[in-house]
């Protein structure tokens, strides 16, 4: 449905021309170029890459490409004082030490500046004590330990396996349980797929491989020292004691060879059930402490990392719109990596690069998009989404008035099985229509559409004949645009078969083994999945920037609002007596959802019928569509999470990666049976229902006829 009338260009310059210009071979070449050395945030190498991308985007034909720098809090290991964990005997002698590095992959032995595995923003410390195994360190794992097994983690060092939830939530849970240190490790049950060899012979994690990552609990704040405002030259910075989201106990990650050495000696309680057992040849005893012969031995952490205010650089490219230059469609992905970034982020950055090149080619031939397209190469995503958040804070007034959509472009692949899309309901129809026009790259689906293979492999749990599209959570650079500013957002990548591969993420995530060769040998030798992702991401941007009427369908929001209201109501109905006692009613919410549904339906009818040649009416209708997402923003934010302001969606309080619907009500209801003051707790539930109902009703009214 792309239209060219508004930009006065030849029919040749349509979506097809843009898509045909995208080439797998270019993506491959760009990926190779971006992955030969590490590009850790705050380093000279990453600054040089920013300048290279700036230069190349200019060559590709963008109107302007600027660097936007900020001075933010980052974290690095001490080069002369490495981090490690020991087992110490009763005399305090270290009888076992964990590795200081990952063994480098073949061909990279002489690369300098490979940052050793560490947990970014861990405080310094050398705690020693007994070990407690806490499974995935989820909220429910600590409930099991403390409530059912009566195991006290206070004063203990806990060891948790990576997976299921964001590592920052694990650390927060451990802190709340009173732990004095956290060891994170990758269990083969989660990071070693059966029947596949470890790198360099396959895509599995070797025993010496370790996942790096930040352990912050920022809740959308951006730079921990300047929450809400850009970390610019005249910024007022908080003291470190007031910084947002920093962990208070030492944390360190290890691989499964080292984990084996710690876990094989564990004594105390047996694991509560099989879900607490991984795949190592150890008993998975919970502890506390080591078994009989080793009971006098303790675990000691040696953490010497430092937090430093460091300059970071975003690259911001602009392709000015011909008709509505004050409406922005943004395509952004990060550039910084933990080491080589073979998948995260450079498989995404290479796709963005090729999308920019294709748009630039069209522009050089005389074409312009209807709306302005902004391209962003974000810095310091790995340190807490810092580059994107600081830029959005600096430009928030422009973005909230002019932001049409944000498309995220981190890793293009996390597998090679099928498409995975998370987006606002406003984009469902856009994604469906686009994927029906694209060819599937999947074996066995030659000549079939991407929509068909995606629907077959990943069917919607609710609607037959449609593919699964998930809620947006966080853990990536769309967060500030969607959760804080209310700009319609989406993301797409190729993923694994979740039914057969139950490991978390992909096995080599954030390890030194995430190389170009990993992608080229094992994931996508022909780069056909990368090309498909480029077509999806680029196609979405093209359509959002070029279609005369914005490709948003507000009726899809109505459908999910009803689904989410039903879901939260059923959670609440697990407490029928309390609902009666405290007069808790969801009538206002269901009424608001009903009103939204009716108004959205009428708006959609008007959208079919209005005079598209009248620029004022066209702009008015488009603005109603653009501002619908904005209407779900509560300026006061969620309780204790002021930068999560979207009332319909927020990152789960128990897992930053996951999205939660009606998060205010959900959190008020969570574990409500354990609250000491039930009257107060149910009062908060009622307040959150009120906020949600009001917001849905207010959003509905933005779609009403304006006069």
């Amino acid at each position: 449905k792309s239209s060219n009338e508004a930009t006065n260009i030849t029919p040749k310059h349509n979506m097809k021309a843009f898509l045909d210009e995208l080439k797998a071979e270019n993506i491959k070449k760009f990926l190779y170029n971006f992955t030969q050395i590490p590009h850790l945030a705050g380093t000279e190498q990453n600054f040089q890459l920013a300048k290279q991308i700036q230069s190349q985007w200019k060559e590709f034909g963008l109107d302007s490409v600027e660097l936007a720098h900020y001075d933010v809090l980052l974290s690095y290991p001490n080069k002369t004082h490495p981090n490690y964990i020991s087992i110490i005997n009763e005399d305090g002698n270290e009888i076992f030490n964990t590795s200081l590095f990952e063994p480098p992959p073949p061909g990279y032995e002489n690369v300098s500046d490979i940052v050793p595995p560490f947990s970014a923003f861990s405080p310094q410390g050398m705690p020693e004590g007994d070990l407690v195994y806490v499974n995935y360190a989820r909220t429910e794992d600590f409930f099991k330990l403390e409530r059912d097994m009566k195991i006290n983690c206070s004063g203990k060092i806990v060891i948790a396996r990576y997976g299921k939830v964001f590592r920052g939530n694990k650390v927060k849970n451990a802190q709340l349980a009173g732990a004095k240190g956290v060891i994170l490790y990758s269990d083969p049950a989660d990071y070693f797929a059966p029947g596949v060899k470890s790198y360099p012979d396959g895509w599995n994690l070797p025993g010496g491989g370790v996942q790096r990552g930040n352990i912050l609990n920022l809740n959308g704040a951006g730079d921990p020292l300047t929450p809400g405002y850009p970390a610019n030259e005249y910024a007022y910075r908080r003291g470190i004691a007031e910084a947002v989201g920093l962990p208070s106990i030492p944390v360190h990650p290890i691989g499964y060879y080292d984990a084996q050495k710690l876990l094989e000696k564990m004594g105390g309680s047996a694991p509560p059930d099989s879900s607490w057992r991984g795949s190592l040849k150890v008993p998975y005893n919970v502890g506390p402490g080591f078994t009989g012969n080793f009971s006098t031995q303790k675990v000691k952490m040696h953490i010497h990392s430092t937090n430093e205010v460091t300059r970071i650089y975003n690259v911001i490219g602009t392709l000015r719109g011909a008709v509505e230059p004050d409406r922005y469609v943004i395509l952004g992905g990060h550039r910084d990596s933990w080491v080589f970034g073979g998948i995260d982020p450079q498989s995404g950055a290479a796709v963005v690069h090729e999308i920019v090149r294709s748009f630039g080619t069209l522009k050089k031939e005389g074409w312009r998009p209807r709306r302005t397209i902004l391209f962003a190469s974000w810095d310091a995503e790995e340190f807490g989404l810092l580059g994107s958040t600081e830029w959005a804070e600096e430009n928030s007034r422009l973005l909230q008035e002019r932001g049409v959509a944000y498309i995220n472009a981190d890793s293009s692949i996390e597998g090679n099985y099928t498409l995975r899309v998370d987006c606002t309901p406003l984009m469902y129809s856009l994604v469906h229509n686009l994927t029906k026009e694209l060819k599937s790259p999947d074996e066995g689906f030659e000549g079939k559409s991407l929509y068909e293979s995606w629907t077959k492999k990943s069917p919607s749990p609710e609607f037959s004949g449609m593919p699964r599209i998930s809620k947006l959570g966080s853990g990536n650079d769309f967060e500030v645009f969607f959760q804080r500013l209310g700009i319609a957002s989406g993301r797409a990548r190729y993923t694994k078969n979740w039914e057969t591969n139950k490991f978390s993420g992909y096995p080599l995530y954030h390890s030194v083994y995430e190389t170009y060769e990993l992608v080229e040998k094992f994931y996508d030798p022909m780069f056909k999945y990368h090309l498909t992702v480029a077509q999806v991401r680029g196609g979405m941007v093209f359509e959002l920037a070029n279609s005369i009427v914005l490709p948003f369908d507000c009726r899809d929001y109505a459908v999910v609002l009803r689904k989410y209201a039903d879901k939260i109501y059923s959670i609440s109905m697990k407490h029928p007596q309390e609902m009666k006692t405290y007069s808790v009613s969801f009538d206002s919410l269901f009424s608001a959802v009903k009103n939204f549904t009716e108004i959205a339906s009428k708006f959609s009818e008007r959208l079919q019928d209005f005079d598209k040649s009248n620029p004022i009416v066209l702009r008015m209708m488009n603005d109603q569509l653009m501002f619908l997402e904005r209407a779900f923003i509560d300026p006061l934010g969620l309780p204790d999470r002021p930068f999560y302001r979207h009332v319909i969606y927020a990152p789960s309080s128990h897992n930053k990666y996951a999205g939660e619907s009606f998060p205010g009500i959900y959190d008020a209801l969570f574990d409500i049976e354990s609250k000491v003051d039930p009257s107060k707790a149910w009062g908060e539930v009622k307040r959150q229902i009120y906020v949600a109902a009001f917001t849905v009703q207010a959003a509905a009214e933005t779609l009403s006829e304006v006069a």
């Epitope: 270290e94 030490n97 590795s99 200081l100 590095f101 990952e102 063994p103 480098p104 073949p106 032995e109 002489n110 060899k197 470890s198 360099p200 012979d201 070797p206 025993g207 010496g208 060879y257």
Partner: antibody
Framework: EVQLVESGGGLVQPGGSLRLSCAAS????????MAWVRQAPGKGLEWVAN????????YYLDSLKSRFTISRDNAKNSLYLQMNSLRAEDTAVYYC?????????????WGQGTTVTVSS | EIVLTQSPDFQSVTPKEKVTITCSAS?????MYWYQQKPDQSPKPWIY???NLASGVPSRFSGSGSGTDFTLTINSLEAEDAATYYC?????????FGQGTKLEIK
């Protein structure tokens, strides 16, 4: 019990060939990289070659690459070293070793060795 | 290739004495590995990843170091420790061993 037993050593003339074998038992052979390490009389240890799990990747000491071939048969739990164009300086005890770390060469289990003598 | 140089080549030591063997690498490596070999026996893994004792190795042994300089220490020598000790790097191919340090009991 984890065990590696080498065989096939002996006396051979310069320019001749020999095939060493190593029989593995007590562990899942296909789960490990394997290696050959040699020791000349009265001298130190010298790594010869490594082979990956399924034999698709091999790594050699550069000076031996054109003459020696490492291979494996996982169905038979066996490792081999084919040595061609042998020279006097190839005289050594040849050890078969299991590589615990895969690719990287930390040898946690060694055979008892088999002696190769190259002499006319 | 990374050349490993051990020092000393030979040492004659009295029981209960502290012994230090060093291994110097021609360029930086991630870890050092040590093996013990007694006459007419196969080498045995002794210390892995610089500082960790292999199974069955007495606690009087320890390993340390980083970068290019690594050390194997015996804090109180016993007669059974008489052997040749080899360091080995696995940072890059070709895998290389030191020339060995022979410990003799006086």
């Amino acid at each position: 019990e984890v065990q590696l037993v080498e065989s096939g050593g002996g006396l051979v003339q310069p320019g001749g060939s020999l095939r060493l074998s190593c029989a593995a038992s007590g562990f899942t052979f296909s789960d490990y990289y394997m290696a050959w390490v040699r020791q000349a009389p009265g001298k130190g240890l010298e790594w010869v070659a490594n082979i990956n799990y399924d034999g698709s990747s091999t790594y050699y000491l550069d000076s031996l690459k054109s003459r020696f071939t490492i291979s494996r048969d996982n169905a038979k739990n066996s490792l081999y070293l084919q040595m061609n164009s042998l020279r006097a300086e190839d005289t050594a005890v040849y050890y078969c070793a299991r590589d615990l770390d895969g690719y990287y060469g930390y040898f946690d289990v060694w055979g008892q060795g088999t002696t190769v003598t190259v002499s006319s | 290739e990374i050349v490993l140089t051990q020092s000393p080549d030979f040492q004659s030591v009295t029981p209960k004495e502290k012994v230090t063997i060093t291994c110097s690498a021609s360029s930086s490596v991630s870890y050092m590995y040590w093996y013990q070999q007694k006459p007419d026996q196969s080498p045995k893994p002794w210390i892995y990843r610089t500082s960790n004792l292999a199974s069955g190795v007495p606690s009087r042994f320890s390993g340390s170091g980083s970068g290019t300089d690594f050390t194997l220490t015996i804090n109180s020598l016993e007669a059974e420790d008489a052997a040749t000790y080899y360091c080995q790097q696995y940072h890059s191919y070709p895998l290389t061993f030191g020339q060995g340090t022979k410990l003799e009991i006086k």
